[in-house]
């Protein structure tokens, strides 16, 4: 799997997960979460050459088509696979409200 | 939706449904498919600039991440959303038989 | 520019249901609540509620009994009210506005032209 | 709810005079160093627009013949040099609790 087991511990220019934090006030201007500060969002880049973790019968195909058309500009590309929510804590006045983000946490990659 | 209807119709720098023609024994070297000759397969391509389409949240929020950090290179991926099967037919011998390849054509696109 | 545009004036019959659009431009949709504000004939201000477009989180007045209804498209940066069992009372000018940005319940930098809704029979 | 009075209901002002105008919330609207408390005016056919931000930041754009007082529970809003073109109805409003609330206004 093209997650932070592997692709943490690789030096990998294929598609492979990549670490990423993101700070909320900072990278994304939303002042109004209490807590987390910001999270390990990651996400997922690299080339997909032949075969390398395709997801799809397409994504095979293309995979084929650009190995035997290299001059072809249809290729698969590196995207995420699994996700996990994040749960944040924040204020509406002085009532605290906890609320379960889905898909904010990228687990592992794919070439689609 | 980023479909033929759609993405054939405009010309569109952004991630869109792309046309491909794929020939099984050229572009493939597959040449013991005796039908079809070849199939429209499609493929995704294109920019994924702010909320252009967004599959999840995650792509959302790297979607913002990038605008506000444009050197970042942290960016979603415009990839496959819906695919349909094909229906291919080959001979084992002389005996024909059918199959229909599931996720062979894209129908639509989305940056993920 | 910042701009919040707002759809036109409504005539409704007791009991339906009206749907505001307020189409924004300007700033990054994602990054502000946005709010909805209603105005009652030469009366005040009632805050009914607020969206967060990102993921679509929301807080309501009880005032308005659930009968409102706030959602978001991101895809065109437009906030959207709609509320429910109209009733002679809920003839009012309804305005979006934008939160301020430092908090999840703020002041309201910019503001949108205002709806007209009838009630009527 | 934390209720808003503002007074006076009506206030008719000379051009180049000073105006003020009140706002006692019905418990104190101060949390974490601030005072959640804002002003703004509507004019006659108009959107509301916001004049000062946390009982005494004047908002960008925005006239400094404008300015807010006050902590706790009271606060007042004072218009230096009066003009013609303040005329309109100015509202305060809370953010310290939910749900968000208006005062009913000064004419």
């Known amino acids: 799997a093209l997650d932070a087991a592997y692709c943490f511990r690789n030096v990998q220019d294929n598609c492979c997960l990549r670490p990423l934090y993101i700070d909320f006030k900072r990278d994304l201007g939303w002042k109004w979460i209490h807590e987390p500060k910001g999270y390990n969002a990651n996400f997922c880049a690299g080339a997909c050459p032949y075969l390398w973790s395709s997801d799809t019968q397409h994504s095979r195909v293309l995979s084929l088509y650009n190995t035997i058309n290299p001059e072809a500009s249809a290729s698969p590309c590196c995207v995420s696979q699994d996700l996990e929510p994040l749960t944040i804590l924040y204020y509406i006045g002085k009532t605290p409200k906890i609320e379960q983000l889905s898909n904010m946490i990228v687990k592992s990659c794919k070439c689609s | 939706a980023l479909d033929a209807a759609y993405c054939f119709r405009n010309v569109q720098d952004n991630c869109c449904l792309r046309p491909l023609y794929i020939d099984f024994k050229r572009d493939l070297g597959w040449k013991w498919i005796h039908e079809p000759k070849g199939y429209n397969a499609n493929f995704c391509a294109g920019a994924c600039p702010y909320l252009w389409s967004s599959d999840t949240q995650h792509s959302r929020v790297l979607s913002l991440y990038n605008t506000i950090n444009p050197e970042a290179s942290a960016s979603p991926c415009c990839v496959s959303q819906d695919l349909e099967p094909l229906t291919i037919l080959y001979y084992i011998g002389k005996t024909p038989k059918i199959e229909q390849l599931s996720n062979m054509i894209v129908k639509s696109c989305k940056c993920s | 520019e910042v701009q919040l545009v707002q759809s036109g004036a409504e005539v409704k019959k007791p009991g339906a249901s009206v749907k505001v659009s307020c189409k924004t431009s300007?700033?990054?949709?994602?990054?502000?609540?946005m709010n909805w504000v209603r105005q009652a004939p030469g009366a005040g201000l009632d805050w009914m509620g607020q969206?967060?477009?990102?993921?679509?989180?929301?807080n309501y007045n009880e005032m308005f009994e659930g009968r409102v209804t706030l959602t978001a498209d991101t895809s065109t940066s437009t906030a959207y009210m709609e509320l429910s069992s109209l009733r002679a009372g809920d003839i009012a000018v309804y305005y979006c506005?934008?939160?301020?940005?430092?908090?999840?319940?703020?002041?309201?930098?910019?503001w949108g032209q205002g709806t007209l809704v009838t009630v009527s029979s | 709810d934390i209720v808003m009075t503002q007074t006076p209901p009506s206030l008719s002002v000379s051009p180049r005079e000073t105006a003020s105008i009140s706002c006692r919330a019905s418990e104190s609207v101060d949390s974490y160093g601030n005072s959640f408390m804002h002003w703004y005016l509507q004019k006659p056919g108009q959107s509301p627009q916001l004049l000062i931000y946390?009982?005494?930041n004047l908002e960008s754009g925005v006239s400094d013949r404008f300015s807010g007082s006050g902590s706790g529970t009271d606060f007042t809003l004072r218009i230096s040099r009066v003009e013609a073109n303040d005329t309109g109805v100015y509202y305060c409003q809370q953010n310290d609790e939910d749900p968000l609330s208006f005062g009913q206004g000064t004419k």
């Open positions: 969206i967060f477009p990102a993921w679509g989180s929301t």
């Open positions: 506005a934008r939160g301020y940005g430092n908090y999840a319940l703020d002041a309201m930098d910019y």
């Open positions: 946390l009982a005494s």
């Open positions: 300007g700033y990054i949709f994602m990054k502000y609540w």
